[in-house]
């Protein structure tokens, strides 16, 4: 009679992570008597996957009933496959011996490849806010995918970005891979409502890329523009001066009025109005009693925005002449105006 052969008909098997892998194996003879064992890998370091004779292998089931006397099908199913299960599996026939069974013949091996989906991309931006015209970096990471081939794209508000660098690790063979990409984005004043999107496409995703997003509202700081104007006289000796704080983001803002360099009042922006682009406007006013001043008054609106150094705008209030009704842009009002930026 011809000597027993162990046949593994599949050179390779490909499954998705989470699926069940079927590893086929048949013997050509019932003789010699002895059990079958499945191993991952060859040589002394091989890992026992299934032993027909003894042991507990909760993830492994046999395709046929191995207790039947004439059974020659030793195929197994391995459930809930992960990338760590990848490798070459050998079906090995043992001959009954005393005290131990002796390895008789091995199959040619079946290479199990596992395809695993990438994790949802995580996008992170800079630790500190930046102002328009500055370039900021965003990173995108996704892990645990196999095979290595993967496509990553960056978008800002639906427009594809080109200034980015991507690495897939490790460089050599591995059961699974990770991708890391850094994109450079130039901020504009209109970016409060903008989104940066990292899109990852992989064969396991069935054509539905995974996306990670970052809102530029968490990255951008739009500094305010200030305008100090003198309003028409409200009473004989009172002048209303307003400070318009425009187009700022985020909302965190503190305003201080100074009269001739002395703090008159400090307030925090509360009832702001929101612009279409997501920035805010706010107005503060100061009622100045002209009769309390002998000389001209220098009024300064000083704004500290989002913990940044204060910016200020001043307005010279003439008290020598009788105050008359003035518009917000009269020559007299602008004469002594100046703007100081402190960085």
């Amino acid at each position: 009679e011809e000597e027993l052969q162990v046949i593994q008909p599949d050179k390779s098997v490909l499954v998705a992570a989470g699926e069940t892998a079927t590893l086929r194996c048949t013997a050509t003879s019932l003789i010699p008597v002895g059990p079958i064992q499945w191993f991952r890998g060859a040589g002394p370091g091989r890992e026992l996957i299934y032993n027909q004779k003894e042991g507990h292998f909760p993830r492994v089931t046999t395709v046929s009933d191995l207790t039947k006397r004439n059974n020659m099908d030793f195929s197994i199913r391995i459930g809930n496959i992960t990338p760590a299960d990848a490798g070459t599996y050998y079906c090995v026939k043992f001959r009954k011996g005393s005290p131990d069974d002796v390895e008789f013949k091995s199959g040619a091996g079946t290479e199990l490849s596992v395809r695993a989906k990438p994790s949802a991309p995580v996008v992170s931006g800079p630790a500190a806010r930046a102002t328009p015209q500055h370039t900021v970096s965003f990173t995108c990471e996704s892990h645990g995918f196999s095979p290595r081939d993967i496509t990553l794209k960056w978008f800002k508000n639906g427009n594809e970005l080109s200034d980015f660098q991507t690495n897939v690790d490790p460089v050599g063979e591995s059961v699974s891979y990770s991708i890391h990409s850094t994109a450079k984005v130039v901020l504009t004043r209109e970016d409060v409502h903008s989104q940066v999107i990292c899109e990852v496409a992989h064969v396991t995703l069935q054509g539905d890329p995974l996306r990670g997003t970052a809102n530029l509202s968490e990255t951008i700081r739009v500094p305010p523009t200030l305008e100090v104007t003198q309003q028409p006289v409200r009473a004989e000796n009172q002048v209303n001066v307003t400070c318009q704080v425009r187009k700022f983001y985020p909302q965190r803002l503190q305003l201080t009025w100074l009269e001739n360099g002395n703090v008159s009042r400090t307030e925090t922006a509360s009832t702001v109005t929101e612009n279409k682009d997501g920035t805010y406007n706010w107005m503060s006013w100061l009622l100045v009693n002209v009769s309390a001043h002998r000389d001209d008054v220098k009024l300064t609106c000083q704004v500290e925005h989002d913990g940044q150094p204060a910016v200020s705008k001043s307005h010279d209030l003439k008290v020598s002449a009788h105050p008359k009704e003035q518009g917000s842009n009269t020559a007299a009002e602008n004469t002594g105006s100046n703007e100081r930026n402190i960085y």
């Epitope: 095979p147 496509t151 064969v203 396991t204 995703l205 069935q206 054509g207 539905d208 890329p209």
Partner: antibody, heavy 118, light 109 residues
């Protein structure tokens, strides 16, 4: 057993429209990207379109210039191809095919013949 | 658009090993092109044999294998049988679309 069954083919005049269906059985449609591929008489295969597993993303052959639209109803396990402004050169057998892992045309239907002629 | 080129016809004998190739006009075929091989038998019967360069569809005989040879994708039939007589199409993926080759008519005499 995986089966794909196309229907809706027939004779249509140039400029007309036709909607092909592909009824899938033996698997859950939403777990797979699906494709339409056509074969003109005596010619080779030409890829037409892909619908992603969710149906949210589509990939189309540039040559069709937006005349064909792929869609799916995952609840009914059915894939569709809406063909508008048909031309004589669109005459072909249209096949739906399943994509395993998005990179593997593993199962094909038997095809639906579309003839565009006046 | 890329052009995918295959041998128009090949002839082999039963038991012989035959290799069909698939070339891309854009350069070397890589694993990112996810080479597919599809068999057409009479009466428009199509079967997906190989996907993703080298993965055999369940139920397809082990004598069919896919690989990259040099700058081309290849389908090798080890020990061809008379029932393997058919037309074989390869398909390559280019970022957002597939392109099929013209097909190879394989005769097994």
């Amino acid at each position: 057993e995986v089966q794909l069954l196309e229907s809706g083919g027939g004779l249509v005049q140039p400029g007309g429209s036709l909607r092909l269906s592909c009824a899938a059985s033996g698997f859950t449609l939403s777990s797979y990207a699906m494709s339409w591929v056509r074969q003109a008489p005596g010619k080779g295969l030409e890829w037409v379109s892909i619908s992603s597993g969710s149906g949210a993303n589509t990939y189309n052959a540039d040559s069709l210039k937006g005349r064909f639209t792929i869609s799916r109803d995952n609840s009914k396990n059915t894939l569709f191809l809406q063909m508008n402004s048909l031309r004589a050169e669109d005459t072909a057998v249209y096949y739906c095919a399943r994509l395993r892992f998005f990179d593997w045309f593993d199962y094909w239907g038997q095809g639906a013949l579309v003839t565009v002629s006046s | 658009q890329a052009v995918v080129t295959q041998e128009s016809a090949l002839t082999t004998s039963p038991g012989e090993t035959v290799t069909l190739t698939c070339r891309s006009s854009t350069g070397a075929v890589t694993t990112s092109n996810y080479a597919n091989w599809v068999q057409e038998k009479p009466d428009h019967l199509f079967t997906g044999l190989i996907g993703g360069t080298n993965n055999r569809t369940p139920g397809v005989p082990a004598r069919f294998s896919g690989s990259l040879i040099g700058d081309k994708a290849a389908l090798t039939i080890t020990g061809a049988q008379t029932e393997d007589e058919a037309i074989y199409f390869c398909a390559l993926w280019y970022s957002n679309h597939w392109v099929f080759g013209g097909g190879t008519k394989l005769t097994v005499l």
